[in-house]
Amino acid sequence: GSVKVLHEPSCFSDYISTSVCQWKMDHPTNCSAELRLSYQLDFMGSENHTCVPENREDSVCVCSMPIDDAVEADVYQLDLWAGQQLLWSGSFQPSKHVKPRTPGNLTVHPNISHTWLLMWTNPYPTENHLHSELTYMVNVSNDNDPEDFKVYNVTYMGPTLRLAASTLKSGASYSARVRAWAQTYNSTWSDWSPSTTWLNYYEPWEQHL
C-alpha cells in the first residue's frame, strides 16, 4: 500500500553533537526497515548522509543524526524516503530548534543552617556556546503527597540550589529533578534529569519549645 506521513518531522538539536527528528506515519510502520531520512548540510562540498530511524511507538519514528558542533549558520536539507518514494522534504536549522542536553548527576547534601544543597552538572563543556546560556528549573515533590511540590527557577550561572529545610515537611521523603533551557536560543526545555530522593529530617522550631 501507499506510505504516508501523518505528522511531518519535528527536529531538535542539542547544539553540540546530535539532532533528533521525530514524525508519525499514518499506520503502524517498521521504521528501520521501510524508511530512511537523508540529511545534508547546506555548505559547499557537503556529502549526503543517511539516518536509519527507529520506532518510538507503532507509527512513530525517531532518527538521531550525528552533527558537528553546531553554529548559527548551519542549515540542513532533510528528505524522508520510503524506498524510491520521497515522502517529505524540508530544511532544519539547529540553532533555531535547540533542546538542551539533560543536566546530570543531581545530588542533595545537608548544608549549614538547616539547608539542603542541591547540585547538578552542566551538560555542556565550557567551550560550547550553550555552557554559559543555561538556566534551570528544579522540581521538588513530596513522595507521599502529590499536592506538596515546589518549582524553583535557577537563573544564575552556578548549577546549584539552596533549599531551606523548613520549607519542606519534616520527616517526609522528597524527590528532586532538574531540567534546563537556553533563553537566548529560545530553546525548548530539556528532558528532566533522573530524580534523586532524600529524607527531610528538619525539626520544626516549635518542637524545641
Partner: antibody, heavy 125, light 112 residues
C-alpha cells in the same frame, strides 16, 4: 608525499572536445573534494569546477556550465574534466587541486592545499 | 556571485621590509566566529600556485611565519615581513565559502 599529476591537455579546434585527467597519490582521495582551476596565458587564476569526495555534488563556474563535466573515479584515485564545445577563450593551463575534506558533516577546510603541475589546453583553428 | 578585489595590483619592496596586500570581498566570508573562508596563494614565475594562508589566518603546512593573514567579514590582509628575494611572484586571494569560488586579480610582488 601528496601528489597530483594532470594529463590530457592538447591543441583542439573550436567546438571540439577534450578530457583532462588528474591522478592523485599520497592521501585518501575519496575523503576530499577536488577542484579544477585554469589560467589563461598571461592572466590570473580562474576557478572552473568542484566535486565533493563521493562525487555526489558538483559545482561549476558560469563560463563552463553546460559544457564541462567534472567527475571522479575513487577506485582509481583519478579526477576528470570532460570539456565539450570548446571555445578560444577556454585556452589555458588547467590545474587540479585538493580542496576541503568532505568526509565530515561540515567539510573541513584547508584551502586548495595541493596543486598539480598543470596541463595546457589550446583551442585554435 | 562574490567578487574579490585586490589592492595594490603591483608592489615593489626592498629585502627586509614588510609587504602588505589587501583583499576585499563583495559579501561577508564569515560562516561562523573564527571561520572566514578566505585564502592566500602565491604563484612563483613558471610554477603552479601554492597555498599560503587558509581560513583568513591559518598558515598552510611548511609556510614560514613571516607570512601572516588577518581580517574578517569582507576585509582581509596578507603581510609578508622581512621580505626575501624568494618571495617574488603573484599573490592571489580566493574565497572558498560558496559557489562559484573566486580569485582576486592578483598582486605582483617585485623585490627591489
Amino acid at each position: 608525499e601528496v601528489q597530483l599529476v594532470e594529463s590530457g591537455g592538447d591543441l583542439v579546434k573550436p567546438g571540439g572536445s577534450l578530457r583532462l585527467s588528474c591522478v592523485a597519490s599520497g592521501f585518501t582521495f575519496r575523503d576530499y573534494a577536488m577542484t579544477w582551476v585554469r589560467q589563461a596565458p598571461g592572466k590570473g587564476l580562474q576557478w572552473v569546477s568542484l566535486i565533493n569526495g563521493s562525487g555526489g555534488k558538483t559545482y561549476y563556474a558560469d563560463a563552463v556550465k553546460g559544457r564541462f563535466t567534472i567527475s571522479r573515479d575513487n577506485a582509481k584515485n583519478t579526477l576528470y574534466l570532460q570539456m565539450n564545445s570548446l571555445r578560444a577563450e577556454d585556452t589555458a593551463v588547467y590545474y587540479c587541486a585538493v580542496d576541503r575534506k568532505t568526509k565530515t558533516i561540515r567539510p573541513q577546510y584547508y584551502g586548495l592545499w595541493v596543486w598539480g603541475q598543470g596541463t595546457l589546453v589550446t583551442v585554435s583553428s | 556571485d562574490i567578487v574579490m578585489t585586490q589592492t595594490p595590483l603591483s608592489l615593489s619592496v626592498s629585502p627586509g621590509e614588510t609587504a602588505s596586500i589587501s583583499c576585499r570581498s563583495s559579501q561577508s566570508l564569515t560562516y561562523s566566529i573564527g571561520y572566514n573562508y578566505l585564502d592566500w596563494y602565491l604563484q612563483k614565475p613558471g610554477q603552479s600556485p601554492q597555498g599560503l594562508i587558509y581560513l583568513g589566518h591559518k598558515r598552510a603546512s611548511g609556510v614560514p611565519d613571516r607570512f601572516s593573514g588577518s581580517g574578517s567579514g569582507t576585509d582581509f590582509t596578507l603581510r609578508i615581513s622581512r621580505v626575501e628575494a624568494n618571495d617574488t611572484g603573484v599573490y592571489y586571494c580566493m574565497q572558498g565559502l560558496q559557489s562559484p569560488l573566486g580569485f582576486g586579480q592578483g598582486t605582483k610582488l617585485e623585490i627591489k
